[in-house]
Amino acid sequence: WELTILHTNDVHSRLEQTSEDSSKCVNASRCMGGVARLFTKVQQIRRAEPNVLLLDAGDQYQGTIWFTVYKGAEVAHFMNALRYDAMALGNHEFDNGVEGLIEPLLKEAKFPILSANIKAKGPLASQISGLYLPYKVLPVGDEVVGIVGYTSKETPFLSNPGTNLVFEDEITALQPEVDKLKTLNVNKIIALGHSGFEMDKLIAQKVRGVDVVVGGHSNTFLYTGNPPSKEVPAGKYPFIVTSDDGRKVPVVQAYAFGKYLGYLKIEFDERGNVISSHGNPILLNSSIPEDPSIKADINKWRIKLDNYSTQELGKTIVYLDGSSQSCRFRECNMGNLICDAMINNNLRHTDEMFWNHVSMCILNGGGIRSPIDERNNGTITWENLAAVLPFGGTFDLVQLKGSTLKKAFEHSVHRYGQSTGEFLQVGGIHVVYDLSRKPGDRVVKLDVLCTKCRVPSYDPLKMDEVYKVILPNFLANGGDGFQMIKDELLRHDSGDQDINVVSTYISKMKVIYPAVEGRIK
């Protein structure tokens, strides 16, 4: 019995087509992805093949103005229109709190939303009961397939799930649910979830009875053969894991941002064994036309976004200096504002011993592309922020050793004075440079804000200690020459859209007046 699994993950509000790098579409003839194009391809496969499932492995939420404005209603609407069969909860589905998940998505979705390792307690238990499920048995042709969901247990550190959701260990939570499916005579089981490729592989290895793993979170690109675009494969598609009980379990993921549609064909025998698995992600490029009816719907929903862009978010009573003359040479107040917003967006009081789980921010000065003049009645709009942060990036959470941070700060000033973008703006860090010293030895003082303290204060950086840092995804990926971050990071979780982080902060503060205050000397 042959099953076709179509899958997406980490779409992050890319409802419209995008450029090849998943930023705003500029030249339509070269654009990719988007739900209208996705629908064309899905329908083409549904017409051609008998047993098809369309699955999403989480993180539909967060990433463009679509989410900022529609807050998840757009996800429910267009996923319903595409007739998704199931979705796993990702960490970003909790970005607007549990209410921001329940009302726009859980109550509106016409497909099951899954996670076996999230357990509700207290008053939330009855409120959320039945709105998401540990598993769902889906009829597919003459057969039935069990889908069991999972979500990163790091979600409390990455989003805002509140105190009434417990995130359990994925493997511990999945096994009894898979066992239950087996007792229901369901012998074809897909684990669909959002914990990253390493956890996907562990689930394939450790959870008895799981036949296929469809993952997300790590934006992993897998491909067999010559890849069709710029993404470099992390392995073959599907990636085959040998389980502890001796079975070959295919593991798949489909990069991110709706650029690809994962396409996996599985042949099962009567016992539910995977006899063969093959496929590849399908690049959703302009050779695939956008579906006219979905496109028309997108255009209708788009109108509200254009109006939103010019509305006031808050006010500034000072000049927000985002000029390259400042931000690439010294501490600039736009850099301070952005870093403060980044830390504020990551306030998670999950442990009495810590005032917060992260206190530090770094931001390449070259990523700040425009100032904002306060003389326009102090008004700040989304449009203004889009000029400051035009690249559609995210502010991510990483874990780095102190020694890596020291290297990063040395790199920040290794060719100081040439107006290059690697000069770092900071938050929760005091750095002192001596530019008379030779490159690689210019950081003379590096103090960082404590987290395991009730009164935050600055302590010297320890080389062997592991620190959490918020930074742009551009830096996490080694951009502007920060190869040491990419090579040495111990953990990387993608965060919220950069503009959204700053806009939310400004809306919250109402009036802002960031200063230059001696963070960088």
Epitope: W1, D142, G246, K248, D269, E270, N273, I275
Partner: antibody, heavy 114, light 107 residues
Framework: EVQLVQSGAEVKKPGASVKVSCKAS????????MNWVMQAPGQSLEWIGR????????FYSQKFKGRATLTVDKSTSTVYMELRSLRSEDTAVYYC???????WGQGTTVTVSS | DIQMTQSPSSLSASVGDRVTITCRAS??????LNWLQQKPGKAPKRLIY???SLDSGVPSRFSGSGSGTEYTLTISSLQPEDFATYYC?????????FGGGTKVEIK
């Protein structure tokens, strides 16, 4: 649990035909196909052909094409193998086996003797 | 048709021995190979499917490997109940074909 139950042993004269049945249970019958395999005394296994339960599509080994016919009765989840123009070398145990031979019938002994 | 050449045709071994049986295909069969065990008077039983996946209930001392045209069944430590005849089966293309069998006997 998958189960395949075959009909009983048969003794046939050369030139006659034999029809062996295989009743399946424990799985979604229409979603799969059935293989037939023969094993002559003291010999290896030999694949005869297969039938897709849903629409009756068949595929035969060249050696048995024209002499073997596979049929299906969906209402009773039963598959049949008919072998015509029997000769002494057709004396063997005939097995039905699921799609990828994960489960087998108990075998039906067919003896061709004058 | 794809020919499956199985070797050895028989072998004598003792309990605890490591036993290796090989199947060579006349052309590339990808991963489309099963290993079956048959005891006298019984129907065959599948041990391994898709070259290396172990059927449920089959002891972990059985393992399969290989690719292209060369495939191997290994029994890491032979047990009394493992004395039987073993067959490979390719299902990469029609007609499906079996190897000639390997009879594992007590030394």
């Amino acid at each position: 649990e998958v189960q395949l139950v075959q009909s009983g042993a048969e003794v046939k004269k050369p030139g006659a035909s034999v029809k062996v049945s295989c009743k399946a249970s424990g799985y979604t019958f229409t979603a799969y196909f059935m293989n037939w395999v023969m094993q002559a005394p003291g010999q290896s296994l030999e694949w005869i052909g297969r039938i897709y339960h849903n629409n009756g599509d068949t595929f035969y080994s060249q050696k048995f094409k024209g002499r073997a016919t596979l049929t299906v009765d969906k209402s009773t989840s039963t598959v049949y193998m008919e072998l015509r123009s029997l000769r002494s070398e057709d004396t063997a145990v005939y097995y039905c086996a699921t799609s990828y031979v994960g489960d087998w019938g108990q075998g039906t002994t067919v003896t061709v003797s004058s | 048709d794809i020919q499956m050449t199985q070797s050895p045709s028989s072998l004598s071994a003792s309990v605890g021995d490591r036993v290796t049986i090989t199947c060579r295909a006349s052309q590339d069969i990808g991963d489309s190979l099963n290993w079956l065990q048959q005891k006298p008077g019984k129907a065959p039983k599948r041990l391994i499917y898709a070259t290396s996946s172990l059927d449920s209930g089959v002891p972990s001392r059985f393992s399969g490997s290989g690719s292209g045209t060369e495939y191997t069944l290994t029994i890491s430590s032979l047990q009394p109940e493992d004395f039987a005849t073993y067959y490979c089966l390719q299902y990469a293309s029609f007609p499906w074909t079996f190897g000639g069998g390997t009879k594992v006997e007590i030394k």
